[in-house]
């Protein structure tokens, strides 16, 4: 629960997050706290499509949400679905694909008057001072698709890493999620080894940058398995 | 318009309860957390919790733990905030604030909660 | 718990001036701070969050800078409808924090 989350001893402990933002390539977005908004981001292509196992829709790609393959199925299996195209149905945002959003349980355009929360802020701020909004939230009407394809600065509140301009991703921070930079070489970066390891974490950290890889830091080899630090480093 | 409408102020006895509530319009309810703040007279402010009211999910800050609760009601799109037992200690105007990035964007007007005996 | 300390307590400058307010962090907190404006009797109002980004419909006149510990918030030109308590709050780690505030006056 959001309690357990924020309230955990081990978030007070957590290093402070270098450059907004940490991970590695097999998730582009190193999983955190499981707090609010669902969003895609390891991307995988059709072809040669393998299932891949996953706790929450920021484990799977932007093309993909994070759910059980059958209906009714073990909620304890769950596997990255391809994302349902507009008027499929749905029951939350991660489950449309890019460019929609579910609303009364269908996907519909996000060029259709409403946008997902984050989205609207995303758009608002990157516009500058909007003296029609009211503390960030946009008006909900249409926005013309030159505004919707704006990209979102580092800070800027997201859904998706496709909604962030270029050298940064969508992760969690607290209750939200904003663009953070992705992580440069040196810089701390979080690996799970096992799937739902991230629940104690405070705030979602970006992949490492092109050519890096999240790997043990060399002199902390002997260290205990909990307190290892694993940075950014080259191939 | 986003707006968040608070109750009125109250005056209470210590060990007495108290329920206060902030009403939404103008958005989505369930799609924006809704966070308490404490200002103490004088003082500067203070985060008590937060609650995701699209599934009931609460955050406390550890001073206000098990001192306070934080509820919501999305039929009504309201937020609460309330004490089994007050203390002279809890004198102070509390506000509710909507947000869904890590800052405080729309807030209510305020609650003054006066504490004698 | 982050502790956030503002200086100056309080300050009084002119219609016009400059006006420079520092607020510092007990750890590092990387770019997550914002600052908001208290009026006497109102509800704090969200000025500039993400450290130097200024919310919808707030005036360029403020702004916000620094980083890891060290920040600062200017308003490059006084007015009088700026009269207020300025607080700085952190966003890095639970719980959110904020400073005790800086008391804005004019002379």
């Known amino acids: 629960t959001l309690n357990s989350v924020l309230n955990s001893n081990a978030i007070k402990n957590l290093p402070p997050p270098l450059g907004g933002a940490a991970g590695h390539p097999g998730s582009a977005v190193s999983a955190a706290p499981g707090i609010l908004y669902p969003g895609g981001n390891k991307y995988q292509t059709i072809d040669n499509y393998q299932p891949y196992p996953c706790a929450e829709d920021e484990e799977c790609g932007t093309d993909e949400y994070c759910a059980s393959p059958t209906r009714g199925g073990d909620a304890g299996v769950q596997i990255c679905l391809a994302c349902r195209k507009r008027r499929k149905r749905c029951m939350r945002h991660a489950m449309c694909c890019p460019g929609n959003y579910c609303k009364n349980g269908i996907c519909v355009s996000s060029d259709q008057n409403h946008f997902r929360g984050e989205i609207e802020e995303t758009i608002t701020e990157s516009f500058g001072n909007d003296h029609s909004t009211l503390d960030g939230y946009s008006r909900r009407t249409t926005l013309s698709s030159k505004m919707y394809h704006t990209k979102g600065q580092e800070g800027s509140v997201c859904l998706r890493s496709s909604d962030c301009a270029s050298g940064l991703c969508c992760a969690r921070h607290f209750w939200s999620k904003i663009c953070k930079p992705v992580l440069k070489e040196g810089q701390v970066c979080t690996k799970h080894r096992r799937k739902g390891s991230h629940g104690l974490e405070i705030f979602q950290r970006c992949y490492c940058g092109e050519g890096l890889s999240c790997r043990i830091q060399k002199d902390h080899h002997q260290a205990s398995n909990s307190s290892r630090l694993h940075t950014c480093q080259r191939h | 318009e986003v707006q968040l409408l608070q109750s009125a102020a109250e005056v209470k006895r210590p060990g007495e309860s108290l329920r206060i509530s902030c009403k939404t319009s103008?958005?989505?309810?369930?799609?924006?957390?809704m966070h308490w703040v404490r200002q103490m007279p004088g003082k500067e402010l203070e985060w008590m919790g937060v609650?995701?009211?699209?599934?009931?999910?609460?955050s406390y800050n550890q001073k206000f733990k098990g001192h306070v609760t934080i509820s919501a009601d999305k039929s009504s799109s309201t937020a609460y905030l309330q004490w089994s037992s007050l203390k002279a200690s809890d004198a102070a105007m509390y506000y509710c604030?909507?947000?869904?990035?890590?800052?405080?964007?729309?807030w209510g007007q305020g609650t003054l909660v006066t504490v004698s005996s | 718990d982050i502790q956030m300390t503002q200086s100056p307590s309080s300050l009084s400058a002119s219609v016009g001036d400059r006006v420079t307010i520092t607020c510092r962090a007990s750890?590092?907190?990387?770019?997550?701070l914002n600052w908001y404006q208290q009026k006497p009797g109102k509800a704090p109002k969200l000025l500039i969050y993400?450290?130097?980004r200024l919310h919808s419909g707030v005036p360029s006149r403020f702004s916000g800078s620094g980083s890891g510990t060290d920040f600062t918030f200017t308003i490059s030109s006084l007015q009088p409808e700026d009269i207020a308590t300025y607080y700085c709050?952190?966003?890095?780690?639970?719980?959110?924090?904020f400073g005790q505030g800086t008391k804005l006056e004019i002379k």
């Open positions: 604030s909507s947000t869904t990035g890590p800052w405080f964007a729309s």
């Open positions: 103008g958005y989505t309810f369930t799609e924006y957390t």
């Open positions: 609650i995701d009211p699209s599934n009931g999910d609460t």
């Open positions: 750890q590092d907190i990387s770019n997550y």
């Open positions: 993400y450290k130097s």
């Open positions: 709050q952190q966003v890095h780690t639970l719980p959110p924090t």
